[in-house]
């Protein structure tokens, strides 16, 4: 009778992770007697995936009832695969003996290979905010995906940006992979609203890649202008003079006005309104009675904007242009929380 | 569901011979490899032996080679463990268990003159 | 034959605390054929872990299995009050087939 052979007919089989890997195997003959055992790898160090006859392998099931009588077919499935069981699988007959069972003979291996999609990208800016003008990182990262070609672009409010390097890890074979890219972005004053984009195609995706995002607005800092102005009397020796925050982001901002250098008041940006390009703008106001003065008035509009160093502007109001009451010490009417009267 | 039964406990005198059936359900015992392993009393677990019930091919320990013998009869599913020649050490727990994954609730034999 | 060597015999932990448990193989053992088995008093014992690393079903994931060769270990991150209990390791890798002597890990 001819020599027992077996057959392992697929050189290898593709299967994407989480899904049922089917390995197939069968003998040409019911002699020696002995069991099948499958493996992975060869030599020594080879892992044991399936006995028939003992051992715990939850995952293994027999496509045919291995124990039937004249049974020659010794296939197996492998359920919810992942990378990590990528590799060649050995269907190996054994022959009984004593002590252990002897391998009898092998097949010629099928190579189990996995493709898994890439986890979704997440994309991470700097950790301080920068102003326009800068060039900042964005870092993109995906995990876990197999085989190791894969296509990463960047994108700034559905432009392609072309300066970045992205690395691909590991460089050898393994069983699955991550790819890490770092984008430069230069920022600019209408950037609150833009986003950047992350995109990774791979086989695994069918065509529809994977995008993580960063909004610019955790990025940018958008330093305000300031305009001092003296608006026209409002009544008999009243001044209003005002303080025009513009264009500034984020809205964290303190205001102080200093008369001749010293502190009058302090106030958070409450109510501001929001420009079209996200930016927001406020603006501060104080009632000064000039006829408390004798001398010119030097008032000064104060901004510490997101923590920065303060910044500020200055106004010299000339108290000779009016008529003076002298020793006079009425207050003005305080008609608005913004207003301030001076003595 | 996998189970495997065992019969009661035995009180045997020294130089009588126990047998010891496990009778299995939930699947066919020619499938697997059934190992039967001693537990004496505080002591460890220490392996018997197997039998392959599809060609009734057996594996010993050196320690019971000769007094032990392991059948198993495919019509009834069930498995069995003979010790001969028996002495107060082989007083102890005997399991049978499913190809190393599933345990008998085991036996209890006491070798007691 | 193949003698395995567990130690401690005997380990002392609180709750919460980290065990870990160890087996030495007398020669080579794949990781394939090494198991773990946990028996409670007046129970059979019960698969825990095969293949060296991989729990049984229903095992909690504080429990671990690592190894190689003749060096085995069963860890386990923090300490339940269920997880009091004796551990074997067991080789089947060539007959006859043989048991550790067992590691006690009990209530300190």
């Known amino acids: 009778e001819e020599e027992l052979q077996v057959i392992q007919p697929d050189k290898s089989v593709l299967v994407a992770a989480g899904e049922t890997a089917t390995l197939r195997c069968t003998a040409t003959s019911l002699i020696p007697v002995g069991p099948i055992q499958w493996f992975r790898g060869a030599g020594p160090g080879r892992e044991l995936i399936y006995n028939q006859k003992e051992g715990h392998f939850p995952r293994v099931t027999t496509v045919s009832d291995l124990t039937k009588r004249n049974n020659m077919d010794f296939s197996i499935r492998i359920g919810n695969i992942t990378p990590a069981d990528a590799g060649t699988y050995y269907c190996v007959k054994f022959r009984k003996g004593s002590p252990d069972d002897v391998e009898f003979k092998s097949g010629a291996g099928t190579e189990l290979s996995v493709r898994a999609k890439p986890s979704a990208p997440v994309v991470s800016g700097p950790a301080a905010r920068a102003t326009p003008q800068h060039t900042v990182s964005f870092t993109c990262e995906s995990h876990g995906f197999s085989p190791r070609d894969i296509t990463l672009k960047w994108f700034k409010n559905g432009n392609e940006l072309s300066d970045f390097q992205t690395n691909v890890d590991p460089v050898g074979e393994s069983v699955s992979y991550s790819i890490h890219s770092t984008a430069k972005v230069v920022l600019t004053r209408e950037d609150v609203h833009s986003q950047v984009i992350c995109e990774v195609a791979h086989v695994t995706l069918q065509g529809d890649p994977l995008r993580g995002t960063a909004n610019l607005s955790e990025t940018i800092r958008v330093p305000p202008t300031l305009e001092v102005t003296q608006q026209p009397v409002r009544a008999e020796n009243q001044v209003n003079v005002t303080c025009q925050v513009r264009k500034f982001y984020p809205q964290r901002l303190q205001l102080t006005w200093l008369e001749n250098g010293n502190v009058s008041r302090t106030e958070t940006a409450s109510t501001v309104t929001e420009n079209k390009d996200g930016t927001y703008n406020w603006m501060s106001w104080l009632l000064v009675n000039v006829s408390a003065h004798r001398d010119d008035v030097k008032l000064t509009c104060q901004v510490e904007h997101d923590g920065q160093p303060a910044v500020s502007k200055s106004h010299d109001l000339k108290v000779s242009a009016h008529p003076k009451e002298q020793g006079s010490n009425t207050a003005a009417e305080n008609t608005g929380s913004n207003e301030r009267n001076i003595y | 569901e996998v189970q495997l039964v065992q019969s009661g406990a035995e009180v045997k005198k020294p130089g009588a011979t126990v047998k010891i059936s496990c009778k299995v359900s939930?699947?066919?015992?020619?499938?697997?490899?059934m190992h039967w392993v001693q537990q004496a009393p505080g002591k460890g677990l220490e392996w018997i032996g197997r039998?392959?019930?599809?060609?009734?091919?057996?594996k010993y320990a050196p320690k019971f080679q000769g007094r032990v013998t392991i059948t198993a009869d495919t019509s009834t599913n069930t498995a069995y463990m003979e010790l001969s020649s028996l002495r107060s050490e082989d007083t102890a727990v005997y399991y049978c268990d499913r190809g190393l994954a599933y345990w008998g609730q085991g036996t209890l034999v006491t070798v007691s003159s | 034959e193949i003698v395995l060597t567990q130690s401690p015999a005997t380990l002392s932990l609180s709750p919460g605390e980290r065990a870990t448990l160890s087996c030495s193989a007398s020669s080579s053992v794949s990781s394939s054929y090494l198991y773990w088995y946990q028996q409670k008093p007046g129970q059979a014992p019960k698969l825990w872990i095969y293949s060296t690393s991989n729990l049984a079903s229903g095992i909690p994931a504080r429990f671990s299995g690592s190894g190689s060769g003749t060096d085995f270990t069963l860890t386990i991150s923090s300490l339940e009050p269920e997880d009091f209990a004796v551990y074997y390791c067991h080789q089947w890798s060539s007959y006859p087939y043989t048991f550790g002597q067992g590691t006690k890990l009990e209530i300190k």
């Open positions: 939930g699947f066919n015992i020619k499938d697997y490899y």
């Open positions: 039998i392959d019930p599809e060609d009734a091919e057996t």
